[in-house]
């Protein structure tokens, strides 16, 4: 049975050309996280496999970095880069766990973070 | 050396899910070399990778794909196991599973070719 | 997602003459770590793929040495410098810098 829940920072806004921390946090189980993919829309970011380390996407490789932790940081960002953002946990025994981050890029300097929820 | 065997049905009900099974023999599937995939091949068409499976359960599915699709291992039993839900005829196909290589430098990591493929059943959906 | 092109789709050809199979890629695969992951495969008549080459120019264990790869950035060649008749079957080459993995759509070689 699952029993966790991905907490994540919820709806955030970050200034264009600026760069943000997308971060999740998985709670409230002791299954073990073997793996988590960062997904934008259909698009794979990166993977950070608790084994092998990271895999970033070459299609973001000049604009994503690993972490902190298995959190990702989008750097140089544009208004295309608005819209939802997964963080997929492959976790053993539990499965597969999903938290959503909506982010909007805004041209002005009016950037403020919204307020962190769960997903169960 | 090593050795890949896909098991399953050869006929598949519309709307039902298609259950395979691939059997690593002659290697662990617990070597962290190595990546496990699925890929398709339509009658008289190309190659269509479906998803990946690493021995510790993390996995990534071709978005094309994703939402009908499960990759699970079972280490236990030296074997991963593809279901694909919902099928209708345009996934009549041959099944291949196969390994990759990984190769992990420096806290990155990153995919290589296929060099194992099972022999791959023909699936045909069909009422 | 990357889209592999392959020319021509198919080759006829007289044995011990060479041969030559083009992969162009729909953007740069350009290696972070300093390799490019595309690999060859070749599938005869009623047999799963065999790779023949890994990471642009590496032969496969077992591989004869008349086939060879080249190419980088969104170019890439499979060379068969003597075709004999058991290279007849479809080429395909694939990339995996990027997830999904993906395929070029085949050549198809014949012998004359």
């Known amino acids: 049975m699952m029993t966790g829940t991905i907490e994540t920072t919820g709806n955030i806004s970050a200034e264009k050309g600026g760069s943000i921390i997308l971060q999740c946090h998985l709670s409230s189980t002791t299954a073990q996280v073997t793996q988590v993919n960062w997904e934008q829309q259909d698009q794979l970011l990166a993977i950070c496999n608790a084994d092998l380390g990271w895999h970033i996407s070459p299609s973001f490789k000049d604009r994503v970095a690993p972490g902190p932790g298995l959190g990702l940081t989008l750097q140089s960002l544009t208004v295309n880069d608005t819209g939802e953002y997964f963080c997929i946990y492959h976790t053993y025994p539990d499965g597969t766990y999903t938290g959503r981050i909506f982010l909007e890029v805004l041209e002005s300097s009016v950037a403020e973070h919204g307020a962190r929820f769960q997903i169960p | 050396q090593v050795q890949l065997q896909e098991s399953g049905p050869g006929l598949v009900k519309p709307s039902e899910t298609l259950s395979l099974t691939c059997i690593v023999s002659?290697?662990?599937?617990?070597?962290?070399?190595?990546?496990w995939s699925w890929i398709r091949q339509h009658p008289g068409k190309g190659l269509e990778w479906i998803g990946y499976?690493?021995?510790?359960?993390?996995?990534y599915y071709n978005p094309s794909l994703k939402s009908r699709v499960i990759i699970s291992v079972d280490t236990t039993k030296n074997q991963f196991s593809l279901k694909l839900s919902s099928m209708t005829a345009a996934d009549t196909a041959v099944y291949y599973c196969?390994?990759?290589?990984?190769?992990?430098?420096?806290?990155?990591?990153?995919?290589?070719?296929?060099?194992?493929w099972g022999q791959g059943p023909t699936v045909t959906v069909s009422s | 997602e990357i889209v592999l092109t392959q020319t021509p789709l198919s080759l006829s050809v007289t044995p011990g003459q060479p041969a030559s199979i083009s992969c162009k890629s729909s953007?740069?695969?350009?290696?972070?770590?300093?390799?490019?992951?595309l690999s060859w495969y070749l599938q005869k008549p009623g047999l799963p793929p065999q790779v023949l080459i890994y990471?642009?120019?590496n032969r496969f264990s077992g591989v004869p040495d008349r086939f060879s790869g080249s190419g980088s950035g969104t170019d890439f060649t499979l060379k068969i410098s003597r075709v004999e008749a058991e290279d007849v079957g479809v080429y395909y080459c694939?990339?995996?810098?990027?997830?999904?993995?993906?395929f070029g759509g085949g050549t198809k070689v014949e012998i004359k």
């Open positions: 196969a390994r990759g290589s990984i190769a992990a430098r420096s806290g990155y990591f990153y995919f290589s070719g296929l060099d194992v």
């Open positions: 002659g290697g662990s599937i617990r070597s962290g070399d190595y990546y």
């Open positions: 499976i690493y021995y510790s359960g993390g996995t």
């Open positions: 953007q740069s695969l350009l290696p972070s770590d300093g390799k490019t992951y």
């Open positions: 990471e642009v120019s």
């Open positions: 694939m990339q995996s810098i990027q997830l999904p993995l993906t």
